[in-house]
């Protein structure tokens, strides 16, 4: 029988200078593309290799944003949130949340509907 | 991933048409934004167009536009080129290109891009 997997949720302010290609990253999400269920967030689904997200280190595929520049990402449309990072100026600064997965007992199994997966 | 297999390309006089298309295999591929690139001989590859993951967010470069049309069908994992007036200058080796999610960058770069196909020839005479 497998263990419980947990999850250990951890919050952090990542701030970001757009470099000469821009932040360096990849979203999935919003109200109209959940990615998670029951979920209309935005979630990183990519890091471009040698981006300031890259550089930077600390964003990683499958942290969920939780805002940019102090302006809440929650409820709005996959584009909606696309064109706000693009708009978001040179300095940009990340509300970001971190889902490590703490294994508890036997290997567990990631579920279809993670989005670290 | 996805792998990405194109098809479609061909020898066609100018002011022909030609449909490409490039299938994915893998999961998720109404999550990936999809792209052609081309690249003509002894130049560098370059962007034509682009679609986000909702037949949405779509973009041109300058020298197709009002002459190329790009389109997804999610439930056959296939984007489309539908190339119209077509003209000597359009003869290269087009490439379908896909990235998992949308780049907040631009999506007019080739190095938005993650996957690549192995290409199709296009000849205009």
């Known amino acids: 029988m497998n263990g419980r997997v947990d999850y250990l949720v951890t919050e952090e302010e990542i701030n970001l200078t757009r470099g000469p290609s821009g932040l360096g990253f990849n979203i999935v999400g919003g109200t109209d593309q959940q990615y998670v269920s029951n979920d209309s967030g935005i979630y990183v689904s990519r890091i471009k290799e040698n981006g300031a997200a890259a550089l930077d280190g600390r964003l990683q595929e499958g942290d969920k944003i939780l805002s940019v520049n102090g302006q809440d990402l929650k409820n709005l449309l996959h584009q909606d949130a696309v064109d706000l990072f693009r708009n978001a100026g040179y300095a940009v600064s990340l509300r970001v949340q971190h889902r490590l997965q703490v294994q508890n007992g036997p290997i567990g199994h990631r579920g279809e509907g993670d989005p670290s997966g | 991933d996805v792998q990405l297999v194109e098809s479609g390309g061909g020898l066609v006089q100018a002011g022909g048409s030609l449909r490409l298309s490039c299938a994915a295999s893998?999961?998720?591929?109404?999550?990936?934004?999809m792209a052609w690139f081309r690249q003509g001989p002894g130049k560098e590859r370059e962007f034509v167009a682009t679609?986000?993951?909702?037949?949405?967010?779509?973009y041109y470069a300058d020298s197709v536009k009002g002459r190329f049309t790009i389109s997804r069908d999610n439930a056959k994992n296939t984007v489309y080129l539908q190339m119209n007036s077509l003209k000597p200058e359009d003869t290269a080796v087009y490439y379908c290109?896909?990235?998992?999610?949308?780049?907040?960058?631009?999506?007019?770069?080739?190095?938005?891009?993650?996957?690549w196909g192995q290409g199709t020839q296009v000849t205009v005479s």
């Open positions: 290109a896909a990235t998992f999610g949308s780049p907040v960058d631009t999506p007019l770069d080739r190095g938005a891009y993650d996957f």
């Open positions: 679609v986000g993951w909702n037949d949405n967010s779509i």
């Open positions: 893998g999961r998720s591929f109404d999550r990936y934004t």
